[in-house]
Structure formats: structure tokens, C-alpha cells
């Protein structure tokens, strides 16, 4: 079938990195600056990516491959591909429509990225807390309370851990 | 595009040579270092990109290192040999991309015991 | 690593001829190539980027052809000015952030 197909149709021969020019006899022509064809036997380039604004380049755009971009700081990545940029926030925040907003009591955001989760709630594995949580670190589970010899306390344990999701606005 | 700071060193000390520019904005370039032994061909050490990446060709990764403040490139070189004795030239990349388009004259590097 | 072949290492033709110079690439680089000039004591001068497009400046007896891995620079309607070396050079991405953006060996233009 291939040898078939590279006799009736002269476009297949052309590589990836050119395209079948109809202007000039069906010849390979190189794609031009800003344009990119990722297969053979292409009778058009696609044009390039560009990192504009808050983009910025990773990889710039070559005959064979599209540009790739990520985000400049204080940013970061969204959609397949990057096709999104996000405001990053500190630890210890989310971001909600309003802008970056501390976590609330009882959740927590290790990331410059994402939701607050709750913190884990140790009684639900019969254990207690070890290490309180904070707004950027969950809590650190310890062995249960029967585990723990006579006369040793353990740390209250937080309130009641909510359902994920955005802090009240 | 001019080069600065290429100058006779012994083998083992660092130097840096740097790369100022006028007339166009680094950070919207891909800013290349190219280097020629006497008598030689050219090869091609790496760029930074309009991003801050940094790309390196295989044999000069690790030893070499390019970094960019608003007006000037530096390429830092490390462990240098006899070998690394070249004019290195610093570049702008042609229309978005790392071809060298835009080259300065080049700074003479000898590196002797 | 990719390699770039450039033939002939040397050519010698009168004023007015042609001249063609070669250039392969050990794997395809699409169309990723460039050719550049270079007089004794002065920076390389690019002439032709992504195989064919013409740099600014640069007058219309250089052309570049090819793509994949051979590629070809023509120099025609020789000039006095034209005696030079002549190096291709690709642009090829490797992994690891690492660049195979060699240049090939050259090739002197003289006269005869």
C-alpha cells in the first residue's frame, strides 16, 4: 500500500519539517520561520505557538515541533499542554475569586498551588494528634490514645475536619 | 554585541566573559555563545532563551554556565584546559529562534601553563 | 550526538560561476538548518536560516534547498566578494535540556 500510495501522491515523500508546496509542482518546501509540520506529507505548516505575556518560552518552535510554553514567576501551569496560567498563592493560601485568601481553621495548603484540604482526622484511625496542624501543614497523627503509657497526655485534637473546597468568599 | 573579559589564564582558573548589548532587549532573545579554536571551525556552546531557560550542547554542560542581567550575558567557565583556548563569540537569535544572527567580534580566550 | 558532513572542504571557481556546497546531517533535522559566512578575522554572518529563508541583508544569488538530511547551498553569479568559508549548522533538541546544534566542518571558496 505505502509504495502505492509514494507513486500516486508525491506529497507523502515530503518529510516532517516541510510541506507539499501545490505553488511549485508538489516539491517539499522547508516550512517557514514561525511555522512547524510534526509529520510527513503535509500539504500545509501549522503555525507556531507564542509565549506571550504571562507565558513564557520553554522550547522554542523548530521546523518539526511546536513552541512549548510555561509560565513566567509567580504563575503556574493549567490545561494540558500549558494552555492556562494561574496565580500562584503562598502556602498556607488558595486562590479564590477575590484573590489569594488564607486557609480557614482546621485546613491547610502546602503548595503555592490548589485548594485547602482538611487536616486528616486522626481519631477516624484511632489514633491522636502528635503534631498540630497549621494553615500550611496538616496535622501529624500519633499512636492511639490506649498506645500511650500511664500519665502521658496527647495534643487536643483539631476540630472537625470540613468537606474540601473553596474558604468562604 | 560585544564581548568583554577573554584574556590569557592558566589551566584550572574560572573566568567569565561577558556580552553587552544596546539597541535591543535581552529578555526578548535568544542569547547565544559560539566559540572558534585558531585555525578551526565553530562550535556552538548554548544559549539562554527569551524564557531563562539555558540549553548547553552535550560536552559543554557542567562546565559551562549562561546567565543574563537586562543588559549583559555572562558565560562562566570552569576546569579550563589548554583545549578551551578559542575567541568565543556571544550571538542574538534570528527571529525567535537559537541561529546565531546578530554576532559581536568575538574575545580571545588562551588558556596556558 | 548529530553529526554535520560538509563537502567539498574546498572550491575553487572564477568570477561569475556557481557554486554548490553540501551539507548532511547524520539524522533529519526537518528543516532545521542554517549557512553561514565567514571572512579571516571577522565574525560568521548567517546567510540562510530554517534551509531556505533568506537572512536580512543577504542578496538573492545565496539560496538554500533540502530538508531531512541533505541540504544544499547555492551561490551563484560568483563574486570577488563571496571568497569565504562556509559552514551549515543545524538546531536539534536532544533530551535532558541538552542541544545537538553543531556545525558542520566548513568550505573555503576561493578563485581561481
Known amino acids: 500500500f505505502e509504495r502505492t500510495r509514494s507513486l500516486q501522491d508525491p506529497c507523502s515523500n515530503c518529510p516532517a519539517g516541510t510541506f507539499c508546496d501545490n505553488n511549485r509542482n508538489q516539491i517539499c518546501s522547508p516550512c517557514p520561520p514561525n511555522s512547524f509540520s510534526s509529520a510527513g506529507g503535509q500539504r500545509t505548516c501549522d503555525i507556531c505557538r507564542q509565549c506571550k505575556g504571562v507565558f513564557r518560552t520553554r522550547k522554542e518552535c523548530s521546523s518539526t515541533s511546536n513552541a512549548e510554553c510555561d509560565c513566567t514567576p509567580g504563575f503556574h501551569c493549567l490545561g494540558a499542554g500549558c494552555s492556562m496560567c494561574e496565580q500562584d498563592c503562598k502556602q498556607g493560601q488558595e486562590l479564590t475569586k477575590k484573590g489569594c485568601k488564607d486557609c480557614c481553621f482546621g485546613t491547610f495548603n502546602d503548595q503555592k498551588r490548589g485548594i485547602c484540604r482538611p487536616w486528616t482526622n486522626c481519631s477516624l484511625d484511632g489514633k491522636s494528634v502528635l503534631v498540630n496542624g497549621t494553615k500550611e501543614r496538616d496535622v501529624v497523627c500519633g499512636p492511639s490514645p490506649a498506645d500511650l503509657s500511664p500519665g502521658a497526655s496527647s495534643v487536643t485534637p483539631p476540630a472537625p475536619a470540613r468537606e474540601p473546597g473553596h474558604s468562604p468568599q | 554585541v560585544e564581548e568583554s573579559g577573554g584574556r590569557l589564564v592558566t589551566p584550572g582558573t574560572p573566568l567569565t566573559l561577558t556580552c553587552t548589548v544596546s539597541?535591543?532587549?535581552?529578555?526578548?532573545?535568544?542569547m547565544i555563545w559560539v566559540r572558534q579554536a585558531p585555525g578551526e571551525g565553530l562550535q556552538y556552546i548554548g544559549f539562554?532563551?527569551?524564557?531563562?531557560y539555558t540549553y548547553y550542547t552535550n560536552w559543554a554542560k557542567g562546565r559551562f554556565t549562561i546567565s543574563r542581567t537586562s543588559t549583559t550575558v555572562d558565560l562562566k567557565m570552569t576546569s579550563l584546559t589548554a583545549a578551551d583556548t578559542a575567541t568565543y563569540f556571544c550571538?542574538?537569535?534570528?527571529?525567535?529562534?537559537?541561529?546565531?544572527?546578530?554576532w559581536g567580534p568575538g574575545t580571545l580566550v588562551t588558556v596556558s601553563s | 550526538d548529530v553529526v554535520m558532513t560538509q563537502t567539498p572542504a574546498s572550491v575553487s571557481e572564477p568570477v561569475r560561476a556557481t557554486v554548490t556546497i553540501k551539507c548532511q546531517a547524520s539524522?533529519?533535522?526537518?528543516?532545521?538548518l542554517a549557512w553561514y559566512q565567514q571572512k579571516p578575522g571577522q565574525p560568521p554572518k548567517l546567510l540562510i536560516y530554517?534551509?531556505?529563508t533568506l537572512a536580512s541583508g543577504v542578496p538573492s544569488r545565496f539560496s538554500g534547498s533540502g530538508s531531512g538530511t541533505e541540504f544544499t547551498l547555492t551561490i551563484s553569479d560568483l563574486e570577488c566578494a563571496d571568497a569565504a568559508t562556509y559552514y551549515c549548522?543545524?538546531?536539534?533538541?536532544?533530551?535532558?535540556?541538552?542541544?545537538?546544534?553543531?556545525f558542520g566542518g566548513g568550505t573555503e571558496v576561493v578563485f581561481k
Open positions: 530554517r534551509a531556505s
Open positions: 539524522q533529519s533535522i526537518g528543516a532545521d
Open positions: 539562554i532563551n527569551d524564557g531563562d
Open positions: 550571538a542574538r537569535g534570528v527571529d525567535g529562534t537559537s541561529y546565531p544572527g546578530l
Open positions: 549548522q543545524c538546531i536539534y533538541y536532544g533530551t535532558d535540556d541538552v542541544i545537538y546544534h553543531t
Open positions: 539597541g535591543f532587549t535581552i529578555s526578548s532573545h535568544h
